[in-house]
């Protein structure tokens, strides 16, 4: 059985302050079942950016319809970017469990924020 891959195609993305940033992520398989989550940073101090299964993330919207049963695109769009949003964002696949178990992380996409053009 081929190993599940989490693909973040862009190593880096640069966005002007005030604009929206699109962070791309696809998976190669929907099995095993379990959620996808987005984090900024790595390790125990990482910040949860988006989790489809629960929580309120008013600045984050999924690019594709996450309710499609065959959806393999877990890209997100973050609105109204500020310099505080700079960092490396990871798309992470979990396997169901109690709690869910981290299975595979994408390579990460570094978001840099440019000054808003005057």
């Amino acid at each position: 059985e081929e190993e599940l891959q989490v693909i973040q195609p862009e190593k880096s993305v640069s966005v002007a302050a005030g604009d929206s940033a699109t962070l791309n992520c696809t998976v190669s398989s929907l099995i095993p079942v379990g959620p996808i989550q987005w984090f900024r940073g790595a390790g125990p101090g990482r910040e949860l950016i988006y989790n489809l299964k629960e929580g309120h993330f008013p600045r984050v919207t999924p690019v594709s319809d996450p309710t499609k049963r065959n959806n393999m695109d877990f890209s997100i769009r973050i609105s109204n970017i500020t310099p505080a949003d700079a960092g490396t964002y990871y798309c992470v696949k979990f396997r169901k469990g109690s709690p869910d178990v981290e299975l595979k992380s994408g390579a990460g996409t570094e978001l840099s924020v440019r000054a808003k053009p005057s």
Epitope: I31, P32, V33, P35, D65, T67, R69, N70, R95
Partner: antibody, heavy 118, light 108 residues
């Protein structure tokens, strides 16, 4: 408070058609996938159709594929089930149900009875 | 015929523990839920994602999984728990929602 109210049930002859409706309120209808589940008299539950939040993707079991069509109007917060070529074995209470992020059913309507009989 | 298998009936005395099992789905591609249905009423979700309890559902209801079998446990069963219990799943490999045939819980 989440509310799902089905309508459109009734008596129909074998080979006939019927359209069921489900009026949703108390949540952001356009953000949730929805399904129809039926229950024949004295029998268990059977899932008969599902639809993504945007309405572009639909799903059916083999038992109704090609005869039933699920659709939705997000501007009216309403879910539909068009049933054609009805058979006696389609006699059941039909429930509409809201889907969770992983396609389980967290809220159900009270159901509408469809009787297929000559 | 039902894709998931559960016992047709379970009987317990008040205060005892009732366990209802459900099997048939591949663990890696399935999410499970349990639904309670009382006569003349719509089903109510009591457990989702194998072992999560929705708000408003009493703590005596719990879910667990082991391999391809999931179990609904009702601790300290009360008379009001008498109902039909359905195991339902989402199968990611077929995009379908199979159900078990239902288990009638009788409180003696």
């Amino acid at each position: 408070e989440v509310q799902l109210v089905e309508s459109g049930g009734g008596v129909v002859q074998p080979g006939g058609s019927l359209r069921l409706s489900c009026a949703a309120s108390g949540f952001t209808f356009s953000s949730n996938a929805m399904s129809w589940v039926r229950q024949a008299p004295g029998k268990g539950l059977e899932w008969v159709a599902g639809i993504s939040a945007g309405g572009s993707d639909t799903y059916y079991p083999a038992s109704v594929k090609g005869r039933f069509t699920i659709s939705r109007d997000n501007s009216k917060n309403t879910l539909y089930l068009q049933m054609n070529s009805l058979r006696a074995e389609d006699t059941a209470v039909y429930y509409c149900a809201r889907e969770t992020w992983n396609h389980l059913f967290d809220y159900w309507g009270q159901g509408t009875l469809v009787t297929v009989s000559s | 015929s039902y894709e998931l298998t559960q016992p047709p009936s379970v009987s317990v005395s008040p205060g005892q523990t009732a366990r209802i099992t459900c099997s048939g789905g591949a663990y890696s591609s399935y999410y499970y839920a349990w639904y309670q249905q009382k006569p003349g009423q719509a089903p109510v979700l009591v457990i989702y994602s194998d072992d999560k309890r929705p708000s408003g559902i009493p703590e005596r209801f719990s879910g667990s999984s082991s391999g391809t079998t999931v179990t609904l446990t009702i601790s300290g069963v009360q008379a009001e728990d008498e109902a039909d219990y359905y195991c339902g799943g989402y199968d990611q490999s077929s995009y379908t929602n199979p159900f078990g045939g239902g288990t009638k819980l009788t409180v003696l």
